[in-house]
């Protein structure tokens, strides 16, 4: 640690005195202190001399000697008082700038330590301090206002009692800056804009911050626009608003608009796109396939995306048949607005019944005209099967009818014994019918197919089963020949139709 001579913490001298402060260290040493006049510095290897031959009250202050090469960063200090009976204060600053909740040091240094008992801090023109001002005093450093607030940004003076009268220092302006959490907050309205050529438009860019020192501008395709700024202060925030008014838009007004605000903390920007169109438009689309297949009893949501300008004047869902003249219940139709010009319309069809298959159309209208988007809904059914015994061209034939959607495939099984359903162990013979005859195939209906199995002689201790399957499920019908005729067994699950 460097050593200062004279080796006293404080030195009191009179104006005009010669002061010589010597600092010695192991390596090179440096003096530092307030920017006061008349000092001369002389360095000589490991010592440095700070001297003046005409001390004034302005030399009052703390002088510190450091050894730059010392890894521990040790320093020594001496405080000099230049005791001027006419000047009790040496003010080191015209202005003090701090952030809110920091301590604000007002650097009026007392030139005579004896005066410490009679010091006080006042606002200029003798006004008292604001309520709740918490401050302390150090003769070496001055007055400290603790946890300074924005409202305490004032002009202050230091007061000392000299011979029974108060002597004021020159004033110090305290600026307490609000802590700026980041760049200004921004809004750009609207987020998207569409106008027909010739219409009027307005774009508003606004920024706000706790501190007045920030800039905001609006740019169009990277060109800064010259727009008059409106300023305001409310809710403890400064607001700056730029409003672009266009009476008759044209194609050159289209493009990207950016609202940019910046302060010492950085920059924020937000953008929007302005589209200028020749005429009104209305576009309908769906992310879904327009041809839908759903299993009976399940639910389906039909969704249509609408892009339109100007806004919609009307819209509705319509059932176009073929089964009934029922119309979708309004409570099942739902509309959500994605943004100003894009909307999603949903029709919910829960627990679909056979009569609800068919065409559903969404219709919308705006000044650009009508548009429609139609979905075709086909229901899927598991096969239903029935078998009868008949004679065709004199031959005994088993006739299997299977009805379902998609079109069922048919397989015949012959198995031993009498059973409702052939299992693997009993199967004697299997016939696949790759091309059953299609009896009916209308849009939105089940497909009915027929398969024939010619049987020369019915074996009485055997069962003939017709099985049909599609992507939804399977169905079967067991035919058991008995002496008194034929007996058929539909499987249990087809005895009850929900």
């Amino acid at each position: 640690i460097p050593v200062i001579e004279p080796s006293v913490p404080e030195l009191v001298v009179k104006p005009g005195a010669t002061v010589t402060l010597r600092c010695v260290g192991n390596g090179s040493v440096e003096w530092d202190g307030p920017p006061s006049p008349h000092w001369t510095l002389y360095s000589d290897g490991s010592s440095s001399i700070l001297s003046t031959n005409n001390a004034t009250f302005q030399n009052t202050g703390t002088y510190r000697c450091t050894e730059p090469g010392d890894p521990l960063g040790g320093s020594a200090a001496i405080h000099l008082y230049v005791k001027d009976p006419a000047r009790p204060w040496n003010v080191l600053a015209q202005e003090v700038v701090v952030f809110e909740d920091q301590d604000a040091l007002l650097p009026c240094l007392l030139t005579d330590p004896v005066l410490e008992a009679g010091v006080s801090l006042v606002r200029v023109r003798g006004r008292p301090l604001m309520r709740h001002t918490n401050y302390s005093f150090s003769p070496w450093h001055g007055f400290t206002i603790h946890r300074a607030k924005f409202i305490q940004s004032q002009d202050y003076q230091c007061s000392a009692l000299m011979g029974g009268r108060k002597v004021m220092s020159i004033s110090i302006r305290l600026k307490v800056q609000k802590v700026i959490p980041g760049p200004p907050a921004l809004t750009l309205v609207p987020a998207e804009l569409v106008r027909i050529r010739g219409e009027a438009a307005q774009i508003v860019c606004s920024a706000s911050s706790v501190d007045v020192n920030f800039d905001v501008f609006l740019q169009h395709n990277n060109t800064k626009l010259a727009i008059p700024q409106q300023s305001d202060f409310h809710n403890n925030r400064y607001q700056k608003v730029l409003t672009l008014n266009l009476d008759q838009v044209d194609f050159q007004h289209a493009g990207n608009y950016s609202c940019v605000a910046s302060n010492v903390q950085g920059k924020h920007s937000t953008s929007m796109f302005f589209r200028v169109v020749e005429s009104a438009y209305l576009n309908l689309s769906s992310e879904q396939n327009l041809i839908q297949e759903v299993t009976v009893g399940e639910g389906l949501n039909l969704k249509v995306m609408v892009e339109a300008y100007p806004g919609l004047q009307g819209f509705n869902w319509t059932y176009l048949g073929p089964f009934s003249d029922h119309q979708p219940e309004p409570k099942l139709a739902n509309a959500t607005t994605k943004d100003t010009y894009r909307h999603t319309f949903t029709l919910s069809l829960p627990r679909l019944k056979p009569s609800e298959a068919g065409r559903y159309s969404f219709l919308a209208r705006n000044p650009g005209g009508w548009r429609a988007l139609t979905f075709e809904l086909t229901l899927r059914y598991p096969p239903e099967v029935s078998v009868i015994w008949t004679f065709i061209n004199g031959s005994g034939t088993l006739l299997c009818a299977a009805s379902g959607y998609p079109q069922p495939n048919v397989t015949w099984l012959q198995c031993s014994g009498h059973t409702d359903r052939c299992d693997e162990a009993q199967v004697l013979q299997v016939w696949d019918d790759p091309y059953p005859e299609v009896l009916s195939q209308e849009p939105f209906h089940k497909v009915t197919v027929q398969s024939l199995l010619t049987v020369e002689t019915l074996e009485h201790n055997q069962t003939y089963e017709c099985r049909a399957h599609n992507s939804v499920g399977s169905g079967s019908w067991a035919f058991i020949p008995i002496s008194a005729g034929a007996h058929t067994h539909p499987p249990d699950e087809f005895l009850f139709t929900p």
Epitope: P34, P35, P37, R64, Q102
Partner: antibody
Framework: QVQLQESGPGLVKPSETLSLTCTVS????????WSWIRQPAGKGLEWIGR???????NYNPSLKSRVTMSVDTSKNQFSLKLSSVTAADTAVYYC???????????WGQGTLVTVSS | QSVLTQPPSASGTPGQRVTISCSGS????????VNWYQQLPGTAPKLLIY???QRPSGVPDRFSGSKSGTSASLAISGLQSEDEADYYC???????????FGGGTKLTVL
Amino acid sequence: QVQLQESGPGLVKPSETLSLTCTVSGGSISSYYWSWIRQPAGKGLEWIGRIYTSGSTNYNPSLKSRVTMSVDTSKNQFSLKLSSVTAADTAVYYCARERLGMFFDYWGQGTLVTVSS
Amino acid sequence: QSVLTQPPSASGTPGQRVTISCSGSSSNIGSNTVNWYQQLPGTAPKLLIYSNNQRPSGVPDRFSGSKSGTSASLAISGLQSEDEADYYCAARDDSLNGVVFGGGTKLTVL
């Protein structure tokens, strides 16, 4: 080794506020005075003002009404704001450490600020 | 208009001694010490002399400073081509509690 680095916009519009920040590295900002000095192209140096780490400031009287300096010891930074700028404020702006004896021992490399619309 | 007055230019040949003057008033040079800065083209100024005649470490002893009354001078002996630069004097000015500079002297090494 103490190093200083000025940062801020290189272009400012007339009547707007010029804002610069000086970041100190290689040493602490504390317990020193820090100054801003400017130099118009082809001209001499002009002292703008100084700030101590406690926030105490002194400004050149010719600029005092337009200048605000502040310090952020937590970031080892100090800053300059010059309001209502005109073309006459176009210059290279330097930040520097000021020592007892009123000399500047460390300087930033300088940043050119142009005032133009 | 600079507060301290310096000649706008000075020149010398390699090996020569050159002196640059700086004159002020009682509120600056008259009552405070003088500092000198060297500014090479395109760079920041560099401290050359402080407290009238003190050289920071790294500055060659070819550079020396002196002060008398309200004037000061910088002397460069054994002039070298790398000394070609602008030189500024500076001092505290009591009337503004700040630093004032000279207008600068452009030194050309012929």
